[in-house]
Interface confidence: low
């Protein structure tokens, strides 16, 4: 016997209190698949999160981070503070890259300069806090 709830499309829920009729998801909730018996509460992008995509009856809201922060984790589950290029985020806050390392982004950690001599090449352009070394011909 077919489950009558299987006829309920995304954006609705199968309301057992009302003879298994397909009822629309209430505001601020959604169902992304058919046949659901409840609608899920929409994610709210608050504080350091901002709304990238509004919640609809069939899909959850999507958040990103306010300026000065960037997303971390699946679905932007966390916002992490940006640093300047040439810095990395530590427990003590943003710190300049140590000599011999660089970071050309506002996120992530400082990486060591390319060691040109390992490939038998000369250094064409020296590395800085913000950029990698550029190797010349051997």
């Amino acid at each position: 016997l077919q489950d009558p709830c299987s006829n309920c499309p995304a954006g609705t829920f199968c309301d057992n209190n009302r003879n298994q009729i397909c009822s629309p998801c209430p505001p601020n909730s959604f169902s992304s698949a058919g046949g659901q018996r409840t609608c899920d509460i929409c994610r709210q992008c608050k504080g350091v999160f901002r709304t990238r995509k509004e919640c609809s009856s069939t899909s959850n809201a999507e958040c990103d981070c306010t300026p000065g922060f960037h997303c971390l984790g699946a679905g932007c589950s966390m916002c992490e503070q940006d640093c300047k290029q040439g810095q990395e985020l530590t427990k003590q806050g943003c710190k300049d890259c140590r000599f011999g390392t660089f970071n050309d982004q506002k996120r992530g950690i400082c990486q060591p300069w390319t060691n040109c001599s390992l490939d038998g090449k000369s250094v064409l352009v020296n590395g800085t806090k913000e950029s990698d070394a550029v190797c010349g011909p051997s």
Epitope: A10, R18, C22, P26
Partner: antibody, heavy 117, light 107 residues
Framework: QVQLKESGPGLVAPSQSLSITCTVS????????ISWVRQPPGKGLEWLGI???????NYNSALKSRLSISKDNSRSQVFLKMNSLQTDDTARYYC???????????WGAGTTVTVSS | DIQMTQSTSSLSASVGDRVTISCSAS??????LNWYQQKPDGTVKLLIY???SLHSGVPSRFSGSGSGTDYSLTISNLEPEDIATYYC?????????FGGGTKLEIK
């Protein structure tokens, strides 16, 4: 630009059936629901039914036995069929887009159907 | 079925007036209420959804409020183009139902 346009026969004889088409543009029927609403002359609005993006339907219980709503996503058309028409089915018939499924954010201009012999 | 009652079928007001149109449900509808405007030519537009959320492009002079069974639409500064019939609609339970409408005229 989002638009809905109803097209119907204008005149229907009593006991015959009614077919109205709602042709939409500017959005896809795979992501929006469409409802049908009618308005008899000098009276208020009456909700007839809805067809969901996935093709499921809900109907006004008072008219359910006479009503059928279907659609063709590829042609962007929704169809209202009503049988056993009587004179009190004379009305302007509207299709409306269901945004978020629970409110009608864009309406067609309506098509007038007169049931008379 | 849930009955929606708009107790005032018509009302007359002057340009600049504050006008309130009421709507009552036969049972609680948990704020699941919309308001529509129908112009004399039959054109229908959404004004307010979920009791108090203003639809995009609708002037801010329109506002909605209410809870339980009693709801209202307020036009704070009546303009000549607001001549229309206003309908409430519940979507708490199928079949979705409309109020009988309130026809607004300018004095």
């Amino acid at each position: 630009q989002v638009q809905l346009k109803e097209s119907g026969p204008g005149l229907v004889a009593p006991s015959q059936s009614l077919s109205i088409t709602c042709t939409v543009s500017g959005f896809s029927l795979t992501t929006y629901a469409i409802s049908w609403v009618r308005q008899p002359p000098g009276k208020g609005l009456e909700w007839l039914g809805i067809i969901w993006p996935g093709g499921g339907t809900n109907y006004n219980s008072a008219l359910k036995s006479r009503l059928s709503i279907s659609k063709d996503n590829s042609r962007s058309q929704v169809f209202l069929k009503m049988n056993s028409l009587q004179t009190d089915d004379t009305a302007r018939y509207y299709c409306a887009r269901g945004a978020g499924t629970w409110y009608f954010d864009v309406w067609g201009a309506g098509t007038t159907v007169t049931v008379s012999s | 079925d849930i009955q929606m009652t708009q107790s005032t079928s018509s009302l007359s007001a002057s340009v600049g007036d504050r006008v309130t149109i009421s709507c009552s449900a036969s049972q609680g509808i948990s704020n699941y209420l919309n308001w529509y405007q129908q112009k004399p030519d039959g054109t229908v537009k959404l004004l307010i959804y979920y009791t108090s959320s203003l639809h995009s492009g609708v002037p801010s002079r329109f506002s909605g409020s209410g809870s339980g069974t009693d709801y209202s639409l307020t036009i704070s500064n009546l303009e000549p183009e607001d001549i229309a019939t206003y309908y409430c609609q519940q979507y708490s339970k199928f079949p979705w139902t409309f109020g009988g409408g309130t026809k607004l005229e300018i004095k």
